[in-house]
């Protein structure tokens, strides 16, 4: 997929910022609000922000500009710059009236269905597990193979550098075609196939990508919130993987939840499968030592480990991936095309 241009976004924060710069009042208010950052630390949900009056005034002036309601896209150029603007403006929306964060990402529909030719897999043994088959599909695609090799290299070896590994993982899940990335990570394994389960759990190179000693989950979130990209991905995940009813149905489409989940890989909040024998996922952190924030910590942990929307989205995608390799499809490229159109 080509990277989305700003013009493809309904209201890109980069465009809105340029418009704002052309208006002296808006420009001054934006700069003032930006300088307020140091005096207003980003509050966690358990904290109340204390806001100087001049910052409130700057926020009030920005509320009438096109910056309010501006958005970014996960695959856009200058994404971090766009997100920086978004979170600066977000303060204007929420100052003095702290609201839950809203995802900065606008959904854009993929323009063309993605094809893959499953017939190329006949070089594999028929009884190969599906994680092996999806890995092979990635290898057979130049772009996927190149991106996967890049993170494989960065994340291997006894002295791997975690921050480099994470950056390459982020690049892979951002730039590889979505079905390749999802196939690689969300491949189904037979319940007793530990080898397959281990392959799946090792997809993100957890020995390098995840912290060697599990930090406190709230510390991890604090670290994440200090980075516009990580914060955006976490908020996007909590927006789209939030159950909306008694059965745990996702607030938006399951596909949107999965996209948000994969968007976290390579950030400080990188989740992973917890074992080789099931499809449970979790953050690599602990709530021990959370003191009076124990409840808040467990709720964050539970958003990953006990989330019916996410659990079912993963299960449904794995069922779909199983069907891809069943004999029911009339043509080897048909399956993915149908699924892509559906989303």
């Amino acid at each position: 997929d080509p990277l989305p241009t700003e013009s493809r976004l309904m209201n890109s924060c980069l465009q809105a910022r340029r418009k704002c710069q052309a208006d002296p009042t808006c420009s001054a208010a934006y700069h003032h609000l930006d300088s307020c950052t140091s005096s207003i630390s980003t509050p966690l949900p358990s904290e109340e922000p204390s806001v100087p009056a001049d910052c409130l005034e700057a926020a009030q002036q920005l509320r009438n500009s096109s910056l309010i309601g501006c958005m970014c896209h996960r695959r856009m150029k200058n994404q971090v710059a766009c997100l920086d603007i978004y979170w600066t403006v977000h303060r204007a929306r929420s100052l003095g009236n702290y609201e839950l964060d809203v995802s900065p990402y606008e959904d854009t529909v993929t323009s063309k269905p993605w094809k893959m030719n499953l017939s190329k897999l006949n070089m594999l043994k028929p009884d190969s597990d599906l994680c092996l088959k999806f890995a092979m599909l990635c290898t057979l695609n130049d772009k996927c193979d190149r991106l996967r090799k890049a993170y494989g290299e960065a994340c291997s070896g006894p002295h791997c550098q975690r921050h480099v590994c994470l950056r390459q993982l982020l690049t892979f899940f951002e730039k590889a075609a979505e079905p390749h990335a999802q196939g690689l990570l969300l491949c189904p394994c037979a319940p007793n196939d530990r080898g397959c389960g281990e392959r799946r759990r090792n997809t993100i190179a957890p020995n390098c990508a995840l912290p060697p000693v599990a930090p406190n989950c709230l510390e991890l979130r604090r670290l994440c919130f200090s980075d516009p990209l990580c914060r955006s991905r976490l908020v996007d995940f909590q927006t789209h993987c939030h159950p909306m009813d008694i059965l745990g149905t996702c607030a938006t489409e399951q596909s949107r939840c999965l996209r948000a989940y994969l968007g976290l890989i390579g950030t400080a909040m990188t989740p992973n499968f917890v074992s080789n024998v099931n499809t449970s996922v979790a953050l690599s952190c602990t709530c021990r030592g959370s003191g009076n924030l124990q409840e808040e910590c467990e709720m964050l942990e539970g958003f990953f480990s006990h989330n019916p929307c996410l659990t079912e989205a993963i299960a449904a995608k794995m069922r779909f991936h199983s069907q891809l390799f069943s004999q029911d499809w009339p043509h080897p490229t048909f399956a993915v095309m149908a699924h892509q159109n559906e989303n």
């Epitope: 008694i246 745990g248 467990e298 709720m299 006990h306 019916p308």
Partner: antibody
Amino acid sequence: EVQLLESGGNLVQPGGSLRLSCAASGFTFSSYAMTWVRQAPGKGLEWVSTISGSGTSTYYADSVKGRFTISRDNSRDTVFLQMNSLRAEDTAVYYCSKPSALRFLHWLAMDVWGQGTLVTVSS
Amino acid sequence: DIQMTQSPSSLSAFVGDRVTITCRASQDIRNYLDWFQQKPGKAPKSLIYAASNLQSGVPSRFGGSGSGTDFTLTINSLQPEDFVTYYCQQYNSYPPTFGGGTKVEIK
């Protein structure tokens, strides 16, 4: 410490009404779905009703639909069960429950329970 | 509605015995099953959540397993305080449903 305390149980005649309350403390009340479960004397547990954290979604067992109403006051950290047109078969200990913080997204999880309040419907 | 069939409905055992209680769902409930213990005149207490996870503060002699339709609660080395009633509950489908209970009695 997380606590749930039910009250309002009493002896009432068939056809009568009663309002049960469950006062919560020790947690962020509005983040959790709350559930009422009952247990007739010498019998098993039966789910009665659940309300979402915001109070916008409510769910009922067929046996009480149209007669019972669940509601909550998030400013007072309290959940209510208004019981109308009571029948002898509604006689039970009524418990209120909630999920743990870890499972707050599973509305039907019942990790924490109150001590219960007895409702007796008899003439 | 999903039927939860718990068996046996009662059992007798000695202190120190290992006992197993089973719960069968009328359809697949994944691992969305909890186990409760109830002492006479008291509220139920959660022992195991999501089929196999021990609630904090629950002794490690309690264990849960299973997925899909068949689930097991195991109590290793029964203690005097364990001779009470146990219930399973599914929360995969609405309405949530409980098993009929298993009363564990002392021999």
